[in-house]
Protein backbone atom coordinates (compact mmCIF):
# COMPACT_ATOMS: atom_id res chain seq x y z
CA UNK A 1 0.00 0.00 0.00
CA UNK A 2 1.11 3.55 -0.66
CA UNK A 3 2.39 5.84 2.06
CA UNK A 4 2.52 9.63 2.04
CA UNK A 5 4.90 11.97 3.80
CA UNK A 6 4.84 15.76 3.84
CA UNK A 7 8.39 16.60 4.92
CA UNK A 8 7.74 20.29 5.59
CA UNK A 9 6.05 20.72 8.95
CA UNK A 10 5.45 24.39 8.21
CA UNK A 11 6.22 27.02 5.62
CA UNK A 12 6.45 30.76 6.22
CA UNK A 13 6.28 33.06 3.22
CA UNK A 14 6.21 36.79 2.54
CA UNK A 15 3.02 38.14 0.99
CA UNK A 16 2.92 37.91 -2.83
CA UNK A 17 5.73 35.33 -2.90
CA UNK A 18 5.49 31.68 -3.93
CA UNK A 19 5.13 28.70 -1.59
CA UNK A 20 6.05 25.18 -2.71
CA UNK A 21 4.77 22.22 -0.71
CA UNK A 22 5.92 18.63 -1.17
CA UNK A 23 4.29 15.25 -0.79
CA UNK A 24 6.54 12.18 -1.04
CA UNK A 25 4.92 8.93 -2.14
CA UNK A 26 6.44 5.58 -1.15
CA UNK A 27 5.38 1.94 -1.44
CA UNK A 28 3.84 2.49 -4.85
CA UNK A 29 4.84 4.05 -8.18
CA UNK A 30 3.59 7.64 -8.20
CA UNK A 31 2.80 7.34 -11.91
CA UNK A 32 0.18 4.72 -11.04
CA UNK A 33 -1.64 6.99 -8.61
CA UNK A 34 -3.70 10.15 -8.46
CA UNK A 35 -2.56 12.72 -5.91
CA UNK A 36 -5.08 15.10 -4.36
CA UNK A 37 -4.37 18.30 -2.46
CA UNK A 38 -6.70 19.76 0.16
CA UNK A 39 -6.54 22.63 2.59
CA UNK A 40 -8.04 23.26 5.97
CA UNK A 41 -8.37 26.88 7.00
CA UNK A 42 -8.76 27.66 10.71
CA UNK A 43 -12.38 27.05 11.71
CA UNK A 44 -13.43 25.85 8.25
CA UNK A 45 -14.16 22.49 6.68
CA UNK A 46 -11.48 20.83 4.59
CA UNK A 47 -11.59 21.89 0.92
CA UNK A 48 -10.40 20.15 -2.25
CA UNK A 49 -7.93 22.29 -4.22
CA UNK A 50 -6.41 20.35 -7.09
CA UNK A 51 -5.46 16.85 -8.21
CA UNK A 52 -3.15 15.25 -10.73
CA UNK A 53 -4.10 11.83 -12.05
CA UNK A 54 -1.97 8.88 -13.14
CA UNK A 55 -2.11 10.14 -16.75
CA UNK A 56 -1.17 13.71 -15.80
CA UNK A 57 -4.68 15.15 -16.06
CA UNK A 58 -5.19 18.04 -13.65
CA UNK A 59 -8.52 18.86 -12.02
CA UNK A 60 -9.01 21.95 -9.90
CA UNK A 61 -11.63 23.34 -7.56
CA UNK A 62 -13.82 25.25 -10.00
CA UNK A 63 -14.15 28.25 -7.71
CA UNK A 64 -10.41 28.96 -7.57
CA UNK A 65 -8.95 30.83 -10.57
CA UNK A 66 -6.36 29.20 -12.80
CA UNK A 67 -2.89 30.43 -11.94
CA UNK A 68 -3.32 30.29 -8.16
CA UNK A 69 -2.46 26.66 -7.39
CA UNK A 70 -0.15 24.62 -9.58
CA UNK A 71 0.19 20.88 -9.04
CA UNK A 72 2.97 18.75 -10.47
CA UNK A 73 4.41 15.28 -10.20
CA UNK A 74 8.08 14.34 -10.32
CA UNK A 75 8.41 10.57 -10.94
CA UNK A 76 12.19 10.60 -10.38
CA UNK A 77 11.76 11.63 -6.74
CA UNK A 78 8.26 10.11 -6.34
CA UNK A 79 7.06 13.55 -5.27
CA UNK A 80 3.98 15.67 -5.92
CA UNK A 81 4.33 19.40 -5.43
CA UNK A 82 1.70 22.04 -4.77
CA UNK A 83 2.82 25.54 -5.69
CA UNK A 84 0.85 28.45 -4.26
CA UNK A 85 1.39 31.58 -6.32
CA UNK A 86 1.00 35.13 -4.99
CA UNK A 87 0.67 34.06 -1.36
CA UNK A 88 -1.91 36.11 0.54
CA UNK A 89 -3.58 35.99 3.96
CA UNK A 90 -6.41 33.74 2.81
CA UNK A 91 -3.81 31.08 1.98
CA UNK A 92 -3.02 30.60 5.69
CA UNK A 93 -4.10 26.99 6.24
CA UNK A 94 -2.94 23.43 6.73
CA UNK A 95 -2.44 21.67 3.40
CA UNK A 96 -2.87 17.91 3.02
CA UNK A 97 -2.04 15.54 0.21
CA UNK A 98 -3.97 12.32 -0.36
CA UNK A 99 -3.47 9.33 -2.62
CA UNK A 100 -5.79 7.36 -4.84
CA UNK A 101 -4.32 4.08 -6.02
CA UNK A 102 -5.43 3.22 -9.54
Amino acid sequence: AGHLEQPQISSTKTLSKTARLECVVSGITISATSVYWYRERPGEVIQFLVSISYDGTVRKESGIPSGKFEVDRIPETSTSTLTIHNVEKQDIATYYCALWEV
Epitope: I52, G56, T57, V58, R59, K60, S62, G63, I64, P65, S66, G67, K68, E70, V71, D72, T83, H85, N86, Q90
Partner: antibody, heavy 118, light 108 residues
Framework: EVQLVQSGGDLVKSGGSLRLSCAAS????????MYWVRQAPGKGLEWVSS????????FYADSVKGRFTISRDNAMTSLYLQMNRLGAEDSAVYYC???????????WGQGTLVTVSS | EIVLTQSPGTLSLSPGERATLSCRAS???????LAWFQQKPGQAPRLLIF???SRATGIPDRFSGSGSGTDFTLTISRLEPEDFAVYHC?????????FGGGTKVDIK
Protein backbone atom coordinates in the same frame (compact mmCIF):
# COMPACT_ATOMS: atom_id res chain seq x y z
CA GLU B 1 -26.27 25.04 -22.15
CA VAL B 2 -23.62 27.42 -20.83
CA GLN B 3 -24.21 30.96 -22.04
CA LEU B 4 -22.24 34.16 -21.41
CA VAL B 5 -23.89 37.29 -22.82
CA GLN B 6 -21.87 40.50 -22.74
CA SER B 7 -22.85 44.16 -22.80
CA GLY B 8 -21.45 47.60 -22.03
CA GLY B 9 -18.92 48.15 -24.80
CA ASP B 10 -18.84 51.70 -26.15
CA LEU B 11 -16.79 54.55 -27.54
CA VAL B 12 -15.31 56.54 -24.66
CA LYS B 13 -12.91 59.47 -24.39
CA SER B 14 -9.40 59.01 -23.03
CA GLY B 15 -9.45 59.28 -19.25
CA GLY B 16 -13.07 58.16 -19.10
CA SER B 17 -14.75 55.17 -17.48
CA LEU B 18 -16.84 52.23 -18.62
CA ARG B 19 -18.48 49.22 -16.99
CA LEU B 20 -18.73 45.90 -18.82
CA SER B 21 -21.23 43.20 -17.87
CA CYS B 22 -21.40 39.47 -18.53
CA ALA B 23 -24.69 37.71 -17.80
CA ALA B 24 -24.25 33.98 -17.18
CA SER B 25 -26.80 31.18 -17.51
CA UNK B 26 -26.93 27.40 -17.91
CA UNK B 27 -24.63 26.58 -14.97
CA UNK B 28 -24.22 27.21 -11.25
CA UNK B 29 -22.52 30.59 -11.54
CA UNK B 30 -21.62 30.78 -7.84
CA UNK B 31 -19.42 27.68 -8.15
CA UNK B 32 -17.08 28.97 -10.86
CA UNK B 33 -14.19 31.34 -11.24
CA MET B 34 -14.61 33.88 -14.03
CA TYR B 35 -12.20 35.82 -16.23
CA TRP B 36 -11.83 38.81 -18.53
CA VAL B 37 -9.60 38.53 -21.60
CA ARG B 38 -9.11 41.24 -24.23
CA GLN B 39 -7.87 41.48 -27.79
CA ALA B 40 -6.69 44.72 -29.37
CA PRO B 41 -7.48 45.09 -33.10
CA GLY B 42 -5.22 42.79 -35.12
CA LYS B 43 -3.37 41.65 -31.98
CA GLY B 44 -3.18 38.56 -29.77
CA LEU B 45 -5.17 37.68 -26.67
CA GLU B 46 -4.33 39.25 -23.30
CA TRP B 47 -5.57 38.02 -19.94
CA VAL B 48 -6.97 40.97 -17.95
CA SER B 49 -8.39 39.72 -14.66
CA SER B 50 -9.68 36.71 -12.70
CA UNK B 51 -12.12 36.37 -9.82
CA UNK B 52 -12.84 33.37 -7.60
CA UNK B 53 -16.34 32.03 -7.01
CA UNK B 54 -16.79 33.88 -3.72
CA UNK B 55 -14.58 36.84 -4.72
CA UNK B 56 -11.90 35.61 -2.32
CA UNK B 57 -9.23 35.50 -5.00
CA UNK B 58 -8.89 38.43 -7.41
CA PHE B 59 -6.01 38.91 -9.83
CA TYR B 60 -5.15 41.60 -12.39
CA ALA B 61 -2.67 42.00 -15.22
CA ASP B 62 -0.06 44.66 -14.41
CA SER B 63 -1.31 46.70 -17.36
CA VAL B 64 -4.69 47.33 -15.69
CA LYS B 65 -3.87 47.12 -11.97
CA GLY B 66 -5.19 50.14 -10.08
CA ARG B 67 -7.49 51.18 -12.94
CA PHE B 68 -9.77 48.17 -13.49
CA THR B 69 -11.95 46.40 -10.91
CA ILE B 70 -13.46 42.97 -11.43
CA SER B 71 -16.56 42.02 -9.45
CA ARG B 72 -19.43 39.58 -9.51
CA ASP B 73 -22.99 39.26 -8.23
CA ASN B 74 -23.73 35.59 -7.63
CA ALA B 75 -27.43 36.30 -6.98
CA MET B 76 -27.71 38.03 -10.36
CA THR B 77 -25.33 35.51 -12.00
CA SER B 78 -23.35 38.38 -13.49
CA LEU B 79 -19.70 39.35 -13.87
CA TYR B 80 -18.52 42.95 -14.18
CA LEU B 81 -15.44 44.90 -15.17
CA GLN B 82 -15.25 48.52 -14.05
CA MET B 83 -12.68 50.33 -16.19
CA ASN B 84 -11.38 53.74 -15.11
CA ARG B 85 -8.73 56.11 -16.52
CA LEU B 86 -9.03 54.50 -19.91
CA GLY B 87 -6.31 55.05 -22.49
CA ALA B 88 -5.88 54.26 -26.18
CA GLU B 89 -4.01 51.07 -25.23
CA ASP B 90 -7.23 49.74 -23.64
CA SER B 91 -9.09 49.74 -26.97
CA ALA B 92 -9.97 46.12 -27.62
CA VAL B 93 -12.66 43.49 -27.81
CA TYR B 94 -13.25 42.30 -24.24
CA TYR B 95 -14.35 38.73 -23.58
CA CYS B 96 -15.64 37.14 -20.40
CA UNK B 97 -14.79 33.48 -19.96
CA UNK B 98 -15.25 30.47 -17.71
CA UNK B 99 -13.12 27.37 -17.23
CA UNK B 100 -14.36 23.93 -18.26
CA UNK B 101 -14.26 20.91 -15.98
CA UNK B 102 -10.69 20.19 -17.09
CA UNK B 103 -9.49 22.86 -19.50
CA UNK B 104 -9.12 26.62 -19.13
CA UNK B 105 -11.39 29.18 -20.83
CA UNK B 106 -13.69 26.55 -22.30
CA UNK B 107 -16.65 28.93 -22.47
CA TRP B 108 -16.55 32.47 -23.85
CA GLY B 109 -18.89 35.41 -24.22
CA GLN B 110 -19.46 36.90 -27.67
CA GLY B 111 -17.13 39.82 -26.96
CA THR B 112 -17.83 43.53 -26.61
CA LEU B 113 -15.88 46.31 -28.30
CA VAL B 114 -14.33 49.11 -26.25
CA THR B 115 -12.91 52.03 -28.24
CA VAL B 116 -10.99 54.79 -26.49
CA SER B 117 -10.57 58.00 -28.46
CA SER B 118 -8.23 60.87 -27.70
CA GLU C 1 5.95 36.55 -16.07
CA ILE C 2 6.18 33.69 -18.55
CA VAL C 3 6.47 35.00 -22.12
CA LEU C 4 5.15 32.71 -24.86
CA THR C 5 6.52 33.16 -28.37
CA GLN C 6 4.66 31.55 -31.26
CA SER C 7 6.17 30.77 -34.63
CA PRO C 8 5.80 31.17 -37.45
CA GLY C 9 3.66 34.30 -37.44
CA THR C 10 1.90 33.08 -40.58
CA LEU C 11 1.79 29.61 -42.10
CA SER C 12 0.60 29.33 -45.70
CA LEU C 13 -0.56 25.83 -46.58
CA SER C 14 -3.03 23.98 -48.78
CA PRO C 15 -5.96 21.84 -47.62
CA GLY C 16 -4.80 18.29 -46.90
CA GLU C 17 -1.33 19.40 -45.81
CA ARG C 18 0.13 19.00 -42.33
CA ALA C 19 0.49 22.11 -40.12
CA THR C 20 3.04 22.33 -37.32
CA LEU C 21 2.79 25.32 -34.98
CA SER C 22 5.33 26.15 -32.29
CA CYS C 23 4.95 27.80 -28.89
CA ARG C 24 8.15 28.54 -26.94
CA ALA C 25 8.13 29.65 -23.29
CA SER C 26 10.66 31.95 -21.62
CA UNK C 27 10.77 29.55 -18.66
CA UNK C 28 9.64 26.00 -18.05
CA UNK C 29 5.88 25.34 -18.15
CA UNK C 30 4.35 22.20 -16.65
CA UNK C 31 2.78 20.03 -19.35
CA UNK C 32 -0.43 20.09 -17.30
CA UNK C 33 -0.87 23.82 -17.93
CA LEU C 34 -0.37 24.48 -21.63
CA ALA C 35 -3.42 25.00 -23.88
CA TRP C 36 -4.18 25.84 -27.50
CA PHE C 37 -7.09 27.86 -28.92
CA GLN C 38 -8.45 28.38 -32.41
CA GLN C 39 -9.95 31.73 -33.40
CA LYS C 40 -11.78 32.65 -36.58
CA PRO C 41 -12.43 36.26 -37.68
CA GLY C 42 -15.16 37.94 -35.66
CA GLN C 43 -15.50 34.99 -33.29
CA ALA C 44 -14.43 34.21 -29.73
CA PRO C 45 -11.55 31.76 -29.31
CA ARG C 46 -12.34 28.04 -28.99
CA LEU C 47 -10.42 25.69 -26.70
CA LEU C 48 -8.74 22.92 -28.70
CA ILE C 49 -6.11 21.36 -26.44
CA PHE C 50 -5.44 21.52 -22.70
CA UNK C 51 -2.73 19.90 -20.59
CA UNK C 52 -0.43 19.97 -23.67
CA UNK C 53 -2.07 17.00 -25.38
CA SER C 54 -5.69 16.45 -24.24
CA ARG C 55 -8.35 17.37 -26.78
CA ALA C 56 -11.30 19.44 -25.57
CA THR C 57 -14.84 18.16 -26.07
CA GLY C 58 -15.81 17.82 -29.73
CA ILE C 59 -12.34 18.53 -31.15
CA PRO C 60 -11.46 16.18 -34.05
CA ASP C 61 -8.45 13.89 -33.73
CA ARG C 62 -6.56 15.60 -36.55
CA PHE C 63 -5.59 18.13 -33.87
CA SER C 64 -2.83 16.98 -31.52
CA GLY C 65 -0.53 18.65 -29.03
CA SER C 66 2.88 17.71 -27.70
CA GLY C 67 5.94 19.10 -25.97
CA SER C 68 7.46 19.74 -22.56
CA GLY C 69 9.61 22.23 -20.71
CA THR C 70 9.80 25.30 -22.92
CA ASP C 71 8.86 23.88 -26.32
CA PHE C 72 5.32 22.95 -27.30
CA THR C 73 3.73 22.04 -30.62
CA LEU C 74 0.25 21.95 -32.10
CA THR C 75 -0.09 19.66 -35.11
CA ILE C 76 -2.99 19.53 -37.56
CA SER C 77 -2.45 16.29 -39.45
CA ARG C 78 -4.51 17.12 -42.54
CA LEU C 79 -5.84 20.64 -42.95
CA GLU C 80 -9.56 20.94 -43.61
CA PRO C 81 -11.02 24.17 -45.08
CA GLU C 82 -12.48 25.10 -41.68
CA ASP C 83 -9.05 24.89 -40.00
CA PHE C 84 -7.74 28.09 -41.58
CA ALA C 85 -7.71 30.43 -38.60
CA VAL C 86 -5.47 31.97 -35.94
CA TYR C 87 -4.09 29.69 -33.21
CA HIS C 88 -3.08 30.89 -29.74
CA CYS C 89 -1.17 29.06 -26.99
CA UNK C 90 -1.74 29.79 -23.30
CA UNK C 91 0.03 28.92 -20.07
CA UNK C 92 -2.36 28.79 -17.14
CA UNK C 93 -0.20 27.36 -14.37
CA UNK C 94 0.72 30.64 -12.77
CA UNK C 95 -0.61 34.16 -12.65
CA UNK C 96 -0.31 36.23 -14.76
CA UNK C 97 -1.83 33.87 -17.30
CA UNK C 98 -0.10 34.52 -20.61
CA PHE C 99 -0.94 33.92 -24.27
CA GLY C 100 1.37 33.68 -27.22
CA GLY C 101 1.10 36.23 -30.02
CA GLY C 102 -0.73 33.81 -32.31
CA THR C 103 -0.03 31.96 -35.55
CA LYS C 104 -2.22 32.56 -38.58
CA VAL C 105 -2.78 29.54 -40.80
CA ASP C 106 -3.93 30.73 -44.20
CA ILE C 107 -4.59 29.17 -47.58
CA LYS C 108 -1.65 29.07 -49.99
Amino acid sequence: EVQLVQSGGDLVKSGGSLRLSCAASGFTFSSYSMYWVRQAPGKGLEWVSSIGSSSTYIFYADSVKGRFTISRDNAMTSLYLQMNRLGAEDSAVYYCARDGELGPFEYWGQGTLVTVSS
Amino acid sequence: EIVLTQSPGTLSLSPGERATLSCRASQSVSTSYLAWFQQKPGQAPRLLIFGTSSRATGIPDRFSGSGSGTDFTLTISRLEPEDFAVYHCLQYGRSPLTFGGGTKVDIK
